[in-house]
């Protein structure tokens, strides 16, 4: 029967006795920077060629002993489970792989760096089709490793890498923390995260998403014909790079920012425990469980958006904290949040030609994080408006002004250290979509945008207390571009998106002994693109 | 994921292009910095990344290496350059003691140093 | 349940050998390195020896090299202490603990065995 | 003779806090990472520690690790009577291809 693994990925209409979806990725090429491996395997034979290359350093200790299979066995058994004939989840993919692990299993940033650029240099000279790189590997934060990564990224190529086996931060280690770089977390057969041992994976907001990695059938290098089971965040991102070449085999056009966004928008959503990670990372962790697409055509029409959680700011006073959406991708809205509650809100402001989203910690906070909602909006045109403090009236207001310009954010940003010990705003009033209404002292961001097509409603919850979370989500066929809070009072701790629902986080009353009076409305800003849809619909 | 100003150890050794009358020496005020793995027990010490200016062509890598080689020589070390980047990162890939960072750090087109260190099979 | 039991202590003479052995269960065995450490009465804990989670490496403690022998039978999860030439002051506890992870093997030990007593008494 | 140096015993009131040091070399605390060991009477030890800082699932965080240089800390807040136990810092030593635990320390709670 089927392994636990592959049917987990596989959509329902592709589940027969076996696993055979729709083209195997063979238009693409899938480089394996890890091990030596066992070509000669049944699983991978023809399907792999290994490369010359070679850089790996000394074994450690002096009673080692080189066993070939024992050399071969991580490498060996991650080009199975990308692209083997019986266990792999892209069976059409071809494989080259460049040794730069040791027979330990460890390696070097600088052989991996070399590594890099054998690739780059083999893409130049003998240009094909799309190009998967996957780097099973992980070590500290490295500034050289993740840069690497980016030129490589920025010239077409898609990185997969594993989180990290350390039951740990991924943003500390590399190339984990590269933000061009697809980062993947392992979950096992109860979509659970992998524990192994004390360690297990890793987690927080630089893992984009979780798949498969405990108890992966797939080639042992003991002989042509074995199989083993091996676990890790290695073997979860073998099963996101088999997804990826069959997504680019299918749509060899894709970008990598596009292809991002259709494992995040295909990937299962809300399945994992989150109890298992530390609670200040459960909000930062991405709650996705990979999957291949329903279909290998049609997903043009949607508006995909993806939200990107910043640095912790720091406590210090003026601490801020910047997320910045992919060179590809437009940021659509900004909102912050702060486990404290003590912050000064955010803004949409311009750096290096681009918008980021900067959020400012207060007087006495722990600290805050950006959230920037960044979407993919083909040939779109979009700009921040801003409104300064109103100080006398009700509270302060701004609009999408110019023709053909639609709401799909709101931020709101203040000087004053607390705006709880001000009057809050009123709601919103109805019918004025194109509007976003904050508290007076506060200066009011509204992200307005032109792209052909585009339309945007805004949707509300409110509850008369807080009651520590209110949601709003969009209804199928519109995507959540913009999550903000009315009002933007003490008690309120931030807003953010998730997948398809704004979130806005405060204070239990319980705790903070508010009035009822002081309601919390979560405001989202749902859109889709009609031009996208008509697209999509002449090309079927 | 991570801001490039992320969570790792960092020692900005701040310097001026004083030494050695370099020709080409850094605009004033510009520093080069030396970064290092946070987790000691994965430090590889003795081998480091020399990463230069985004622009910098591979002519002048190789100059860049060359000069820091004669540099050292001049003060009694012996350095290997182990590899030379080009294609994705213009730099070197130099074997030398720690003591030369300081010296490294100052010559031109150099944008940050990082000490090699250990990756693992996950 | 995560669970090592040692085996195969008992009084032995000076010279002669024993072999200890410590059967785990509740894990993926072979996906982790293996520590046997000792503790003589009243006294602190010590290290013996260590072997990677596939065997390809062995370490000792000096005090033991050439002596003692760890191996591991990774079908029956099972890991072994061979002690030969034992002397008086081999007389301990002996605990097989397991590795916090298969490659990180200086991350130290999370799950200890209770101990089988080796006595070595003419 | 153990190559890592810990006090033979520290003491202190329920509530209070107690720290244990750990002396070691470059070759072993300078470059591995730290773990503390908790041996309580008559049963085997138990990881507190991992990494210099991280504790295993199920560890209080009453337990905290630290490093500076070539020296390890241990510290215990909110002394408990069920504390009273030996403690061990461990690493690895590059220099002797070995892993090495410190001498221990034996935390009494005063009544």
């Known amino acids: 029967s089927i392994p636990w693994n592959l049917e987990r990925i596989t959509p329902p209409r592709y589940r027969a006795d076996e696993y055979q979806p729709p083209d195997g990725g063979s238009l693409v090429e899938v480089y394996l920077l890890d091990t030596s491996i066992q070509s000669d395997h049944r699983e991978i034979e023809g399907r792999v060629m290994v490369t010359d290359f070679e850089n790996v350093p000394e074994e450690d200790g002096t009673r080692f002993h080189r066993q070939a299979s024992k050399c071969d066995s991580h490498g060996t058994h991650l080009a199975g489970v990308v692209s083997g004939r019986d266990a792999g989840v892209a069976k059409g993919a071809s494989m080259r792989s460049l040794r730069v692990l040791n027979c330990q299993g460890k390696g070097t940033v600088s052989g991996t760096l070399i590594g890099l650029e054998f690739i780059r240099k083999s893409q130049l000279v003998q240009p094909v089709g799309p190009l998967v790189v996957l780097l099973p590997l992980a070590g500290g934060y490295s500034r050289v490793l993740n840069a690497a990564c980016q030129r490589l990224a920025r010239a077409g190529v898609v990185l997969v890498t594993a989180a990290g086996n350390f039951r740990d931060d991924a943003c500390l280690y590399s190339p984990a923390s590269a933000p061009e770089v697809i980062t993947v977390g392992a979950t096992n057969a109860q979509d659970q995260p992998v524990t192994l041992g004390t360690l297990g994976t890793n987690f927080g907001r630089c893992v984009d998403l979780f798949a498969p990695g405990e108890d992966i059938i797939g080639a042992s290098s003991d002989c042509s014909t074995c199989f083993v089971s091996q676990s890790g965040t290695s073997q979860a991102a073998a099963h996101v790079a088999g997804i990826a070449a069959m997504m680019l085999s299918a749509e060899p056009e894709l970008t990598l920012a596009e292809l991002r966004q259709r494992l995040i928008h295909f990937s299962a959503k809300d399945v994992i425990n989150e109890a298992w990670f530390p609670e200040d990372q459960r909000v930062l962790t991405p709650n996705l469980v990979a999957a291949l697409p329903p279909s290998t055509h049609g997903a043009g029409w949607q508006l995909f958006c993806r939200t990107v959680w910043s640095a912790h700011s720091g406590p210090t006073r003026m601490a801020t904290a910047i997320a910045r959406c992919a060179p590809d991708e437009e940021l659509l809205s900004c909102s912050s949040f702060s486990r404290s509650g003590k912050r000064r809100g955010e803004r949409m402001e311009a750096q290096g030609g681009k918008l980021v989203c900067r959020a400012h910690n207060a007087f006495g906070g722990e600290g805050v994080y950006a959230i920037a909602r960044c979407c993919l909006l083909p040939q779109a045109n979009c700009s921040v408006h801003t409104a300064p403090p109103a100080e006398a009236s009700m509270g302060t207001r701004v609009h999408c002004h110019q023709q053909g310009h639609v709401l799909t954010g709101c931020s709101s940003h203040w000087e004053v250290e607390d705006l709880g010990t001000h009057k809050p705003p009123v709601l919103r009033p109805r019918g004025q979509p194109n509007q976003c209404v904050g508290h007076r002292e506060a200066s009011i961001h509204a992200s307005c945008c032109h792209a052909p097509g585009l339309e945007c409603k805004v949707k509300e919850h409110g509850i008369p207390a807080p009651q520590g979370q209110v949601t709003v989500a969009c209804e199928e066929g519109w995507t959540l571009t913009g999550c903000s809070a009315l009002p933007g009072t003490s008690h309120v701790l931030g807003a953010y998106a998730v997948d398809n629902t704004c979130v806005v986080r405060s204070r239990d009353v319980s705790t903070t002994g508010s009035t009822s009076e002081e309601a919390v409305t979560a405001v989202a800003i749902c859109c889709r693109s009609r031009h996208l849809a008509q697209a999509s619909q002449e090309l079927q | 994921q991570e801001d490039e100003d992320g969570d790792y150890e960092e020692l900005v050794l701040a310097l001026r292009s004083e030494e050695d009358g370099l020709a080409e020496a850094p605009e004033h005020g510009t520093t080069a910095t030396f970064h290092r793995c946070a987790k000691d027990p994965w430090r590889l010490p003795g081998t480091y990344v020399v990463v230069l200016k985004e622009e910098t062509h591979l002519s002048q890598s190789e100059r860049t290496a060359r000069r820091l080689q004669a540099q050292a020589a001049r003060r009694g070390y012996l350095t290997k350059i182990l590899h030379v980047f080009h294609g994705l990162l213009p730099g070197f890939l130099v074997k030398m003691s720690g003591d030369l960072l300081e010296l490294a750090l100052k010559l031109p087109h150099v944008d940050y140093i990082e000490e090699d260190s250990s990756v693992f099979a996950q | 349940q995560v669970h090592l039991v040692e085996s195969g202590g008992g009084v032995v003479q000076p010279g002669r050998s024993l072999r200890l052995s410590c059967a785990a269960s509740?894990?993926?065995?072979?996906?982790?390195?293996m520590h046997w450490v000792r503790q003589a009465p009243g006294k602190g804990l010590e290290w013996v020896a260590l072997?990677?989670?596939?065997?390809?490496?062995?370490y000792y403690a000096d005090s033991v090299k050439g002596r003692f022998t760890i191996s591991r039978d990774n079908s029956k999860n099972t890991l072994y202490l061979q002690m030969n030439s034992l002397r008086a002051e081999d007389t301990a506890v002996y605990y097989c603990?397991?590795?916090?992870?298969?490659?990180?093997?200086?991350?130290?030990?999370?799950?200890w065995g209770q101990g089988t007593t080796v006595t070595v008494s003419s | 003779q153990s190559v890592l140096t810990q006090p033979p015993s520290v003491s202190a009131a329920p509530g209070q806090k107690v720290t244990i040091s750990c002396s070691g070399s470059?070759?072993?605390?300078?470059?591995?990472?730290v773990s503390w060991y908790q041996q309580l009477p008559g049963t085997a030890p138990k990881l507190l520690i991992y990494?210099?800082?991280k504790r295993p699932s199920g560890i209080p965080d009453r337990f905290s690790g630290s490093k500076s240089g070539t020296s390890a800390t241990l510290g215990i807040t909110g002394l408990q009577t069920g504390d009273e136990a030996d403690y061990y810092c461990?690493?690895?030593?590059?220099?002797?291809?070995?892993?090495?635990f410190g001498t221990g320390t034996r935390v009494t709670v005063l009544q």
């Open positions: 603990a397991r590795a916090i992870a298969a490659l990180y093997y200086y991350y130290g030990m999370d799950v």
């Open positions: 509740g894990f993926t065995f072979n996906s982790f390195g």
């Open positions: 072997i990677w989670s596939d065997g390809s490496d062995e």
């Open positions: 470059s070759s072993n605390i300078g470059n591995n990472f």
């Open positions: 990494d210099y800082n």
């Open positions: 461990g690493t690895w030593d590059s220099s002797l291809s070995a892993y090495v």
